[in-house]
């Protein structure tokens, strides 16, 4: 029961992260004017991954596309391309672990199969929450590093009688959703990995066969293959000698832990 | 197309409160846009007081944000200005304007002359 | 508070010929993230209240003849009337919609020589 409740809640947890990786991408506010000094403006400039708008205090709004590729800054490219990826990995993370689902049956599928998918879709959502946590850690030192520097620029070169305001930016909220989306993904991802280690079945409950070989018999036992997970050992793949050949019967069956779910 | 129509008494006296209201035709003050008052004094150039934006938050001129109030009353799609402690430097012409793209007034109210006078 | 300083106070110019009206603020009303000119040109007649003209400090307003245009950017900006009608006869006024309070210049009177 612990082990569909871990799979349910990282699926519902990664799930929750994922559209707040979509909704932070898409977001305009990832770099907002920065209102310390003037805390009532008459236009305010914030900016997105995609976009840049101006909000009028009289209730104007315009938004502009970045509609060049090349003259756009090289980090902000690879802050795209980091929430992209992010979301590709979480989307295929949120389809491969629709199928791993525990309380979901499609046809005949074992549980070392679902085990094998839920660890998948487990690193895809790590991958996917770190891709986040790195894209939104980019934007920010670059718009630290750009803040200090306007600050800088703006107590030189007043000598002349006219002043220039210049615009400094700073953190928007799309910032604070993709960490905490990252945060959630990054954590519903190692939810779906612990489950997996339940799920992989430690002995499975089939019927050993007996080959009956001249000499001696020997009972082939199959073991539960942890389904590749590197969690455990594999030593459960034992060949069962004793004196003389068993019926089906006699040998002992151990029964999943699975099965009382 | 948004019209608006200034409305209120002429003639203040010193130290009283001047209250004005401006009745809007044909859009709704919640719907968007700012709605200001300026103020022209007779043969002077103009001055704007102040504005109550379509979700209600209002900004003022520093010079007479102690003496003014600028509310609103949805209700019958009006705003009001409010100048306490008035004197005679505050005769003036009192327009009413939207503001909108460029922060620019496009539409004004035809005005209306306050003298204060005892 | 930005200062928006108008020149001339007045001009005279014939029917027909062009008239340039200059402004100038104590601040660059130029916004970095759109940049735009927030500067507005308007009109007024006596006894009426002002009209827009100009936005953004080149955008004319629908319906404002052409022969109307803004230039300038930063702190330095001009409004011309190419050929001056007996109808433009009026007073300009410069205003600030960069920076709170919105300020306007003292006006420019525009008549005919």
């Known amino acids: 029961m612990a082990v569909t409740a871990c799979q349910g809640l990282g699926f519902v947890v990664s799930l929750i992260g994922i559209a707040g990786i979509i909704a932070a991408t898409c977001m305009d506010q990832w770099s907002t004017q920065d209102l310390y000094n003037n805390p009532v403006t008459a236009v305010f400039n914030y900016q997105g991954l995609w976009r840049s708008c101006v909000r009028e205090s009289s209730g104007f709004t315009e938004c502009r596309g970045y509609f060049t590729l090349l003259g756009l800054p090289a980090m902000l490219q690879a802050v795209r391309a980091l929430m992209i990826v992010g979301i590709v990995l979480g989307a295929i993370g949120l389809l491969v672990s629709i199928f791993a689902l525990k309380c979901i049956r499609i046809g005949s599928m074992e549980d070392s199969a679902k085990a094998n998918m839920t660890l998948t879709s487990g690193i895809m959502f790590i991958v996917s929450g770190l891709c986040a946590i790195a894209g939104v850690s980019v934007f920010a030192n670059m718009l630290v590093t750009n803040f200090w520097m306007s600050t800088a620029n703006m107590y030189t070169g007043m000598g002349g009688m006219v002043q220039t305001v210049q615009t400094r930016y700073t953190f928007g909220a799309a910032l604070f959703v993709g960490w905490v989306a990252g945060g959630l993904t990054l954590i519903g991802g190692v939810m779906m990995c612990i489950a997996c280690r339940g799920l992989a079945p430690e002995e499975t409950n089939y019927k050993a066969v007996s080959y009956h070989a001249s000499g001696h018999s020997v009972a082939y036992k199959p073991g539960g293959f942890k389904a590749s997970t590197g969690f455990g050992s594999n030593t459960k793949n034992k060949k069962i000698y004793d004196g003389g050949a068993r019926t089906e019967d006699e040998v002992q069956s151990y029964p999943s832990k699975h099965d009382y779910v | 197309q948004v019209q608006l129509q200034e409305s209120g008494p002429g003639l203040v006296k010193p130290s009283e409160t001047l209250s004005l209201t401006c009745t809007v035709s044909?859009?709704?003050?919640?719907?968007?846009?700012?709605w200001n008052w300026i103020r022209q004094p007779p043969g002077k150039g103009l001055e704007w007081i102040g504005y109550?934006?379509?979700?209600?938050?209002?900004n003022y001129n520093p010079s007479l944000k102690s003496r003014v109030t600028i509310s609103r009353d949805t209700s019958k799609n009006q705003f009001s200005l409010k100048l306490s402690s008035v004197t005679a430097a505050d005769t003036a012409v009192y327009y009413c304007a939207t503001s909108y793209y460029g922060n620019s007034f496009i539409y004004w109210g035809q005005g209306t002359l306050v003298t204060v006078s005892s | 508070d930005i200062v928006m300083t108008q020149s001339p106070d007045s001009l005279a110019v014939s029917l027909g010929e062009r008239a340039t009206i200059n402004c100038k603020s104590s601040q660059s009303l130029l916004n970095s993230g759109n940049q735009k000119n927030y500067l507005t040109w308007y009109q007024q007649k006596p006894g009426q209240p002002p009209k827009l003209l100009i936005y953004?400090?080149?955008t004319r307003e629908s319906g404002v003849p052409d022969r109307f245009s803004g230039s300038g950017s930063g702190t330095d900006f001009t409004l011309t009337i190419s050929s001056l009608q007996a109808e433009d006869v009026a007073v300009y006024y410069c205003?600030?919609?960069?920076?709170?309070?919105?300020?306007f210049g003292q006006g420019t009177k525009v008549e005919i020589k």
């Open positions: 205003q600030n919609a960069y920076s709170f309070p919105w300020t």
């Open positions: 109550i934006n379509y979700s209600g938050n209002t």
């Open positions: 044909g859009y709704s003050i919640t719907s968007n846009y700012a």
């Open positions: 953004w400090a080149s």
